[in-house]
Interface confidence: medium
C-alpha cells in the first residue's frame, strides 16, 4: 500500500511543498522528539507475572540500526509462590514501527520504508480452551 | 544484516551513516500486517491486567491511526475474577517511529517522529516501600 495522499478537501497542497520525483517521497530522518524522556515503570520485565527478556538486533543497513525485541520467559505465568502456573499463558504484546531500509544494487543505493513488528513485552492471559467433540 | 561489499570502482564509497534526508519508495514493505489490535488478538480482554484500546487519529501522521492502551484496573484480576490490589496493572510502553508530514499537508514530504505509545498492560508485583 502506498502512503495515502491526504484526500480531505480542507487540505490544500501548499505551494511550499518540495518537488519530489514520481513514485517516491522525501524523508528527513532527523527524528522529531529524539531526546524525549521515557518514564517506564521500574524493572517490569522481571516483576511481571509474565516476565520477559530483551535481545537487541543490529543491522547497519536499517535505520535505526538497533531494534530491541522482548521474548516471554515462560509458557505459563508466575504465581504468588513464584512457581510457573501452566493453567495460564504468557503471551507477547506486539507493536508495529517504521524503519528505513538501505538497499545496495551494484553501485546505486536506494531506500525503502519497512514496517517492523516489535515484541514489546508479555502479559498473562486466561487460555482459550477448545473442547473437542 | 551484513553490509553488502561495495564494488571498489563505485564512486563516493558509501558512508556508514545514513544521510539526513533520503528519497524513499512510496511503497512500504510488510505494509499489510494487521494494524488494528482489536482484530489481531483479544489479549486486551483475556489478560489478568486487561486494558482498553483508544483510537488516536492524526491525518498529518503515517500511520494516521494508532491505538493506545489504558489499563482498566489498578490491581490485577485474580482466579475468582476479582481485582486483587496486592498486584498492579502497569502499561507496557514502547517508542515507535512514525512519519510526520513536513511541511504540514504536503503529500510526499515527511520527517521521522518518535512517539511513545502504551501497547498493553502487564501484571506486576508491587515494590512496597515501608515508610519508617
Amino acid at each position: 500500500r502506498k502512503i495515502p495522499k491526504v484526500g480531505h478537501t480542507f487540505f490544500q497542497k501548499p505551494e511550499s511543498c518540495p518537488p519530489v520525483p514520481g513514485g517516491s517521497m522525501k524523508l528527513d530522518i532527523g527524528i522529531i522528539n529524539e531526546n524525549q524522556r521515557v518514564s517506564m515503570s521500574r524493572n517490569i520485565e522481571s516483576r511481571s507475572t509474565s516476565p520477559w527478556n530483551y535481545t537487541v538486533t543490529w543491522d547497519p543497513n536499517r535505520y535505526p540500526s538497533e531494534v530491541v525485541q522482548a521474548q516471554c520467559r515462560n509458557l505459563g505465568c508466575i504465581n504468588a509462590q513464584g512457581k510457573e502456573d501452566i493453567s495460564m499463558n504468557s503471551v507477547p504484546i506486539q507493536q508495529e514501527t517504521l524503519v528505513v531500509r538501505r538497499k545496495h544494487q551494484g553501485c546505486s543505493v536506494s531506500f525503502q520504508l519497512e514496517k517492523v513488528l516489535v515484541t514489546v513485552g508479555c502479559t498473562c492471559v486466561t487460555p482459550v480452551i477448545h473442547h473437542v467433540q | 544484516g551484513i553490509t553488502i561489499p561495495r564494488n571498489p570502482g563505485c564512486p563516493n564509497s558509501e558512508d556508514k551513516n545514513f544521510p539526513r534526508t533520503v528519497m524513499v519508495n512510496l511503497n512500504i514493505h510488510n505494509r499489510n500486517t494487521n494494524t488494528n489490535p482489536k482484530r489481531s488478538s483479544d489479549y486486551y480482554n483475556r489478560s489478568t491486567s486487561p486494558w482498553n484500546l483508544h483510537r488516536n487519529e492524526d491525518p498529518e501522521r503515517y500511520p494516521s491511526v494508532i491505538w493506545e492502551a489504558k489499563c482498566r484496573h489498578l490491581g490485577c484480576i485474580n482466579a475468582d475474577g476479582n481485582v486483587d490490589y496486592h498486584m498492579n496493572s502497569v502499561p507496557i510502553q514502547q517508542e515507535i517511529l512514525v512519519l510526520r508530514r513536513e511541511p504540514p499537508h504536503c503529500p510526499n514530504s515527511f520527517r521521522l517522529e518518535k512517539i511513545l505509545v502504551s501497547v498493553g498492560c502487564t501484571c506486576v508485583t508491587p515494590i512496597v516501600h515501608h515508610v519508617a
Epitope: - | N52, H54, K70, L74, V90
Partner: nanobody
Framework: EVQLVESGGGLVQPGGSLRLSCAAS????????VGWFRQAPGKEREFIGA????????YYAVSEKDRFTISRDNSKNTLYLQMSSLRPEDTAVYYC????????????????WGQGTLVTVSS
C-alpha cells in the same frame, strides 16, 4: 514528564463540600495512575485514593470512601477530588500525585507531585 498544579482549596464550613482540581501538563497524562494525598499540620502524609489511567478503576483509603470521590477527565488532563460532609479534621494540605505504577503511588513514592492546596474546615 508531568507537571501537576492543584487548585480549589480554601476555607469551608463544617458539613460543607469542596471540589479540588489538579491540572496536569504532559501528553501522556492518560497513561499515569493519579491520586490524592493529604497532610494535616504535624501529621504524616496520608493516602486518600487513586484512579487508573483509563478511569475505570478507583481505589480509596477505606476511611474516606463514603465522603470523597475521585475522578479524572483525560481530555482536559485534569484530576478531581470531590469532598462532602467536611469536618475540621479534614483540614490539611491536599496533594495531587502521579506515577506509572499504583504500587509506588499508594505508598507515597510517586515520581510526580504537585505543590499542594490548603483546605481549612472551620466555622
Amino acid at each position: 514528564e508531568v507537571q501537576l498544579v492543584e487548585s480549589g482549596g480554601g476555607l469551608v464550613q463544617p458539613g460543607g463540600s469542596l471540589r479540588l482540581s489538579c491540572a496536569a501538563s504532559g501528553r501522556t497524562f492518560s497513561s499515569y495512575v493519579v491520586g490524592w494525598f493529604r497532610q494535616a499540620p504535624g501529621k504524616e502524609r496520608e493516602f486518600i485514593g487513586a484512579i487508573s489511567g483509563s478511569g475505570d478503576s478507583i481505589y480509596y483509603a477505606v476511611s474516606e470512601k463514603d465522603r470523597f470521590t475521585i475522578s479524572r477527565d483525560n481530555s482536559k488532563n485534569t484530576l478531581y477530588l470531590q469532598m462532602s460532609s467536611l469536618r475540621p479534621e479534614d483540614t490539611a494540605v491536599y496533594y495531587c500525585t502521579a506515577d506509572q505504577e499504583f504500587g509506588y503511588l499508594r505508598f507515597g513514592r510517586s515520581e510526580y507531585w504537585g505543590q499542594g492546596t490548603l483546605v481549612t474546615v472551620s466555622s
